[in-house]
Amino acid sequence: EPAVYFKEQFLDGDGWTSRWIESKHKSDFGKFVLSSGKFYGDEEKDKGLQTSQDARFYALSASFEPFSNKGQTLVVQFTVKHEQNIDCGGGYVKLFPNSLDQTDMHGDSEYNIMFGPDICGPGTKKVHVIFNYKGKNVLINKDIRCKDDEFTHLYTLIVRPDNTYEVKIDNSQVESGSLEDDWDFLPPKKIKDPDASKPEDWDERAKIDDPTDSKPEDWDKPEHIPDPDAKKPEDWDEEMDGEWEPPVIQNPEYKGEWKPRQIDNPDYKGTWIHPEIDNPEYSPDPSIYAYDNFGVLGLDLWQVKSGTIFDNFLITNDEAYAEEFGNETWGVTKAAEKQMKDKQDEEQRTRRMMRTKMRMRRMRRTRRKMRRKMSPARPRTSCREACLQGWTEA
């Protein structure tokens, strides 16, 4: 039997307002509203918390019966829909201990785990997975790309008691591995030996000058020489013009700086590699994954352009149940959501085309009127008379 610690689908109208608490840390936090957005698969089932004000911080949270994930799997799952074509904003959740003062939740409030998508400018389109380990927020060393389209997506984090993890988007694995390998929770296993230093006679030169090579005697020639073909101009007056000097040209026999040929260095020892030793600071921690207390799920975000919808929150200890729940919620409505969006896009295209056609028609009409105004006035005669008068149309 799976343990379901928290589940929120917003299926009871305004009932969510009694379960979710707004932070009062700042007076100008943005407001969440219940909405299924501009397009959806099922208007009722797809209702979720939507950010509604641009360029705002948001801080909202819901509490649940506190639990510890020691000795068991932890699964955190929710859906996010950036229907506003987001430019910069968070779509992540934070799991806090139950000691959090929900009315004072803010960006620096200490959390246990932060997970979910974050988009900001062209440089950030990633899924954050951050663990608070011994009081420090430790970021994952891998880059997990998030979805940046306008549709609803399902995000799942699985943390197992064997210190492994998995991240899924739309019920498909996008990343997995070991907590110790993919985060810097622990000091490195090996460090450079602080007592070792490169011996003074260590030769890192692969090539050296050939000591037997010597410069040829005829090597040194000047770079520039007087032009042998130059002649003093006939009108040159040494009293007036000074002593005539021929112009200088590049010496064809100039060989440049002589360098001895290079040979393999018989004393070459290669690049000195600093020897490593076991790090005395390192000790394994089999309980990296474990937290004594989870009690609050919070949305602590900044959004430049609002419109993101959060729905189908689930915290459980059962991976299969979470996958099933995802398929029964996001999985059921995703196709219809895309259909509705495609239909809206098609209607918009048609409307745009119609507007363009109307504009073109108006422009043609205006042009005709202008032409009539511009052309010279003609006498009002019948066609027959005009023809008899010999008029011809230009």
């Epitope: 960006g107 950030t124 975000l301």
Partner: antibody
Framework: EVQLVQSGAEVKKPGSSVKVSCKAS????????ISWVRQAPGQGLEWMGG????????NYAQKFQGRVTITADESTSTAYMELSSLRSEDTAVYYC????????????????????WGQGTTVTVSS | SYELTQPPSVSVAPGKTARITCGGN??????VHWYQQKPGQAPVLVIY???KRPSGIPERFSGSNSGNTATLTISGTQAMDEADYYC?????????FGGGTKLTVL
């Protein structure tokens, strides 16, 4: 990689204001946060505040609150720092520095340090 | 307000290991960055997030952070490493720098 070029040296009278500019090139301006750091002669580094151009909001060190204004113009990829009510203690080299923006939260870029710095602008306050 | 404390100066013989410390209350819970500054020049980031090296920074620079002390280690110190070094962290919604340490290579 982004490069930051700052405006030239300034000599100011006590009580006046100074506005230093920092133009970014070679990168997407909206992908960075810009901090302003000053260094008085023979002293250490002191953070004054910063701005994330894509947010449009600035964050200031308590010490400079009310006296410093940091702005950014995305169209010209330029950040500005204006310091008012100048006194002789404000004589310093003023640096702008950028941090890669790796997320939408204010604190995100501070996880990555300031990896590109301007050449510095010397501001001398003297009567 | 949060404070970071560095020794004013550290001396090291060429080829030896230099260690510069940065003390702060529970600094191990924060992300610490280190900057190198040579006379008349702008600072250069040499370590970020406690122990990560930006591209172009030699391998001899490393960092660690736990408890109340963060440490910048320069192994096989060279004459060119002589400079001022500053630690930096994010504390109480503000950026905080240490007072700086002058590293002298003997």
């Amino acid at each position: 990689e982004v490069q930051l070029v700052q405006s030239g040296a300034e000599v100011k009278k006590p009580g006046s204001s100074v506005k230093v500019s920092c133009k970014a090139s070679g990168g997407t301006f909206s992908s960075y946060a810009i901090s302003w750091v000053r260094q008085a002669p023979g002293q250490g580094l002191e953070w004054m505040g910063g701005i994330i151009p894509i947010f449009g909001t600035a964050n200031y060190a308590q010490k400079f609150q009310g006296r410093v204004t940091i702005t950014a113009d995305e169209s010209t990829s330029t950040a500005y720092m204006e310091l008012s009510s100048l006194r002789s203690e404000d004589t310093a080299v003023y640096y702008c520095a950028s941090s890669p923006l790796r997320g939408s939260g204010w604190y995100w870029h501070y996880y990555y340090g300031m990896d590109v710095w301007g050449q510095g602008t010397t501001v001398t306050v003297s009567s | 307000s949060y404070e970071l404390t560095q020794p004013p100066s550290v001396s090291v013989a060429p080829g030896k290991t230099a260690r510069i410390t940065c003390g702060g209350n529970k600094i191990g819970t924060k992300s610490v960055h280190w900057y190198q500054q040579k006379p008349g020049q702008a600072p250069v980031l040499v370590i970020y997030q406690d122990s990560k090296r930006p591209s172009g920074i030699p391998e001899r620079f490393s960092g660690s952070n736990s408890g109340n002390t963060a440490t910048l280690t320069i192994s096989g110190t060279q004459a060119m490493d002589e400079a001022d070094y500053y630690c930096q962290a994010w504390g109480s919604s503000t950026v905080v720098f240490g007072g700086g340490t002058k590293l002298t290579v003997l």
